[in-house]
Each structure stands twice: as structure tokens, then as C-alpha cells.
Amino acid sequence: EAHKSEIAHRYNDLGEQHFKGLVLIAFSQYLQKCSYDEHAKLVQEVTDFAKTCVADESAANCDKSLHTLFGDKLCAIPNLRENYGELADCCTKQEPERNECFLQHKDDNPSLPPFERPEAEAMCTSFKENPTTFMGHYLHEVARRHPYFYAPELLYYAEQYNEILTQCCAEADKESCLTPKLDGVKEKALVSSVRQRMKCSSMQKFGERAFKAWAVARLSQTFPNADFAEITKLATDLTKVNKECCHGDLLECADDRAELAKYMCENQATISSKLQTCCDKPLLKKAHCLSEVEHDTMPADLPAIAADFVEDQEVCKNYAEAKDVFLGTFLYEYSRRHPDYSVSLLLRLAKKYEATLEKCCAEANPPACYGTVLAEFQPLVEEPKNLVKTNCDLYEKLGEYGFQNAILVRYTQKAPQVSTPTLVEAARNLGRVGTKCCTLPEDQRLPCVEDYLSAILNRVCLLHEKTPVSEHVTKCCSGSLVERRPCFSALTVDETYVPKEFKAETFTFHSDICTLPEKEKQIKKQTALAELVKHKPKATAEQLKTVMDDFAQFLDTCCKAADKDTCFSTEGPNLVTRCKDALA
């Protein structure tokens, strides 16, 4: 229903704490360079204004849209042009163009230093002094680095953070309590970020229909006992929630997500038998829990998919009468039978089925034409299954770091023009798929591997869009989202690439590497590996292994030496010479 004052409505629905958190996230995602204090001041002003509207919905400006209110606030920031350049031009536009303009200026790779975690004692001190400010800093720092982070989920992670600090700051050994727990939250939040970015990409590039198809497949896998009408309702609601968050309408998004969680918990009987545990939790935990609830048990008596979609004489008639509904029921029926497939694969199968009907229904004898469609699915299914087997075998043999290196070599050969930091980031993220998915039961591996890889490759595409350098990457990124991963997998060595000159300074290291944390050491070594491949794209695996083993030995020796600096300056040039010879 329409409300006299949108801002009062959202404040009442969400409550002050969530309202302030969401406004802070929204401002931090739009203006990524502003300090926490600048944003905190704006948030307080907006909150005070919302309270006046709650008291009197007819008060001045209370009837304005949230975009107008928030946009006016952002545009009133001093030195906007100096700090944000052409983003300031957005302020010359009217709504809704102004908001669209802000969205277009969101930066997926902002020039911000990595978010460093303070040491335990300092963290606990500032947390105890002012938990609200501490959490505000967390929301601000994550939101500005991840401008599409799913806002209600970020509130959930902040709540997790809060609980961990409350528990660990009371312990004697704060460090050993905090580190593993916060690392766990960080890992989950980073995965959540790339997954949500993928959803927003789907929405931005291919529209609501594409996202809704994704939602139908995903929900049908999770709730195979729900009927098609129920799945359609959930998919429609979920599409609305995501559209709002991707569009920067964070208050509406969080409010609608809470409504959806409420609906699911009130209708468990027609959705799934697995929801009760989630529904017993408070709001943020409930919505998070529902988003990753385990699959319900599949009905035992499902007929073969062929009955309605191949053998039925009415296929083309049903397709003609309501294409989207018919294809939606196909996607629903296929997905509920295959929780072991990735959503990407299910969407490729639905696309193949649609293309088959488009072709066959135009023929004089359609049933004879589409009769073999399910058999034609086989190669589409086998390809990702082989990918999972090959990659999980390799991961089990090499471990995470070795597996990342293998991927780094592979992807540097596919797209050597891409910047080394981007290749290293991508390979490290792609390599984590092993730890994340290969340890799962067989029937969960494929959906885990492929949907995670698709999300990581979406980030590769977003970064490449800013500075397109590789035709290979442009080709794979230009197609549909579900075809990207197979496209990248199919890429081979880029024959058009002119190898980089060998520069000794690229492979020159100093003693400061010895004191770096293990992760940073790995990144240094992987940077060198990518540069080696750019120098010799057709180097064999053996040659690269020889060089990397030599490099690791060199680091180990010099970092243990009494005079590290001398070791690096004398042994370094010898290492460079050996590398050149090994790759000659």
C-alpha cells in the first residue's frame, strides 16, 4: 500500500538500529572514498529527519522518495567534484536518472588499501569503548570495498562480528579466540560478496527474467516438494528483493526480505519440511539461515521428465500458449529432480530445450524433431562433471596452494594480456574452490564448484570491462552468464600474444619478503609465476616446476641466512640466470 511518508514507513518497519546500518551501507556503497565520520554525520542527519517524519508524516519533505532524500544528501557533500570527479555530474540530473548515474559510478575495484584487522587487544579496547561505532566502522569498510554487497546480509555479518568480539574479548587469550572465528566470517562474507555481485550482474545485463530463471532453478532444487505456483511466488519475491538491493534501494530490500522470510515461515507446510530450525531464529539469522537451508527430501514418486516435455503430443501447443510458463515448468521439474546439478547447468539445459522447441515446433512433424532432446543434454551434463573430477583430482594431489598455481599458469596462458595482480587474485579465488567444494559429498560437488567458479569469473569480467586487454576474455565475458564458465574452460593458449621481455628486476627479491605473512609470501611467488608464464607462455609444467622449486629453495635458504641482505643480493642474480636457462 502507498504510505504518506516512505522514510517514516521504512524507519518504523526496520527499527532504528537496522535503519541506521542500512543508510550507512547505502552511503558507503555510493561514495566509496568518504571517511566513516563523514558518512556517520549524514546517517545521523537522515535518522533525525526520519524521526520527525514518524512523529508527523505531513512534515516538510517527508513525502519525498528515498532516492530524492538520499541523493540530495549525497549531492550536498562539500568538495564532491574534487574527490569524485565526474560522479558530481550526477547531481545535475533529476530522479530517477540521478540514482542510475550514481549506480553507474560504483567502482568494483576501488583504490583503497586492504582492510587490515587491528591486533586483538586494540580491537577489544575500541569495541568495549563504543560497540556501535566499532560496528559502524565495520559496515563502512566492507560496504565501500564491496559496493554491491547484499545489505541485509552485511547486517548479519556485522552481528556475527559483534557476537565473536563479545565472546572473545572476555577471554584471556583474545588472539587465538578471535583469529579463527573472524577468519571464518571474512571468508564467508567474501564468498557472499562475489555471489551477490553475480546476481546484480545478471539483473543489470540480462534483466529480471534472467534472474527469475536463476531463482526458479535454485528454489526448485531446495524445495522439491513445493508446487510450481509456490516456487513462482518465491522466485518473484526474491527477484524483487534482489532488484532493490542491486539498485541501491537498501531499506526496501531489507524490509521485503524480512517479509519474504516471514511468509516462508508461515507457509512451511507448502514449502519445505526443513525450515523450522531457521524460523526459530531472530530476523537476521533467520533470513540468512533460510538462504542456505538444506535441500528438502525429494518426492519419491516423481514421473520421468519425458512424459510432459517430450512424449506429450501437446508440447508445441503448450509452448505456444505460454512460452515463459511452459519453460518455467520445465526448469522447475528438471531442477527439483537434480539437486546434484549446478544452477548454471540447469539454465543451460533449459536454454537448450527452448532452442530445440523453437526449431522443432516450426517443423511439420515436431514430435519427431524434439524426441531426442533429452539425449542431447548428455554432453552438456558430462562437460561440467569432467571439469569437477579433473580439478578435484588435481586439488587432492597438489593441495590449495599448488592447485592455485596450476590455475594461475592455465589462466595466464589463456589471457596473458590481463594484469598480473588480476590474474593472481582470480587464480587464488578460483583455487579456493578445491578447499570449498572438493571435500563435499559427490552429489554436492558439481553445484558447489560450478556456481562458485561462475561467480569468480564474473568478477574477472567486471575488472576486465574497466580496461579490456584480452580478446579471449572479452569473448567469454560478452556471452550469457551461464556460458561464461564453459567458455573460459575451453580457452587455450593465446597464440596472438607476443611474449614479454625478460626483466631481471621482476624476479629480484629482497630480505623484507622473509617477514611477510604466509599469504603475502604466496602472492609474491605467484606474481613471479605469472610473470614467468608471460615471458614463456609455452613453458612446460616441468620447466615451471623446476623454476618455482628453485625459487622456493632460494627464499628458504636466504630467509634462514644470518646475513639475509647479502644472501639475497648475491644469490638473487644467480637465481635469475638459472631461471632464464631453465626456460630457454
Epitope: 501437446e314 508445441c316 501447443k317 511439420a364 515436431p366
Partner: nanobody, 115 residues
Framework: EVQLLESGGGLVQPGGSLRLSCAAS????????MSWVRQAPGKGPEWVSS????????LYADSVAGRFTISRDNSKNTLYLQMNSLRPEDTAVYYC????????SSQGTLVTVSS
Amino acid sequence: EVQLLESGGGLVQPGGSLRLSCAASGFTFRSFGMSWVRQAPGKGPEWVSSISGSGSDTLYADSVAGRFTISRDNSKNTLYLQMNSLRPEDTAVYYCTIGGSLSRSSQGTLVTVSS
């Protein structure tokens, strides 16, 4: 909403001719193969003839081959069935369908062949 409206039926003497039409709406007509199906009193539906979306391919039941001709005009969203050398056993309700469907989703048009 898909709609199919047949016309052109009537009473005709054996050996005579009729031309049936089917006006289609509510879907992309040119993208679908179309068929004519008939149902004689007290009997089940019987497939008569089919044509591809472009009109380039046609198929006929043995019982009508050489006597009936299926055609279409995609600019008018209309399907036709030219019936020559009609026989008493051709008496039936004729209806057009989408694809290979045998079920009727329209009223059909009655063709009676009798002297």
C-alpha cells in the same frame, strides 16, 4: 491468449471440394508448425495433415494424400486445407492445432460429405 477459429465447412456431395481456413491469434504463428485434425462422429481424433512454420514442408495421412493440400499465409496468420475429391468417409469435425497436438482447443468446422 491463443485462439484458433476454423471456418469453411459445410455440406458437399461426394467428389466435391471445400477450402477450410483457420485464423490464428495470440502466438507467433510463423514460428509454429500447424496441423489439421478431424474427428468423425463416435470416433477418436485422427491426424490429417501438417505444415512447417515457413510452409516449406508438408505431411499427409495416407487416407488424404493426393486429394488434400495444406498451406498457410503467415502475413495473415491463417492456415488452409484445400479438400478435393471428397468422400463420405471424410465426414467429420475438422480443427486446426499447433504442432503435433491431437487435442482440440477450438470449436472446429463440420464437413459433411453426402449425396
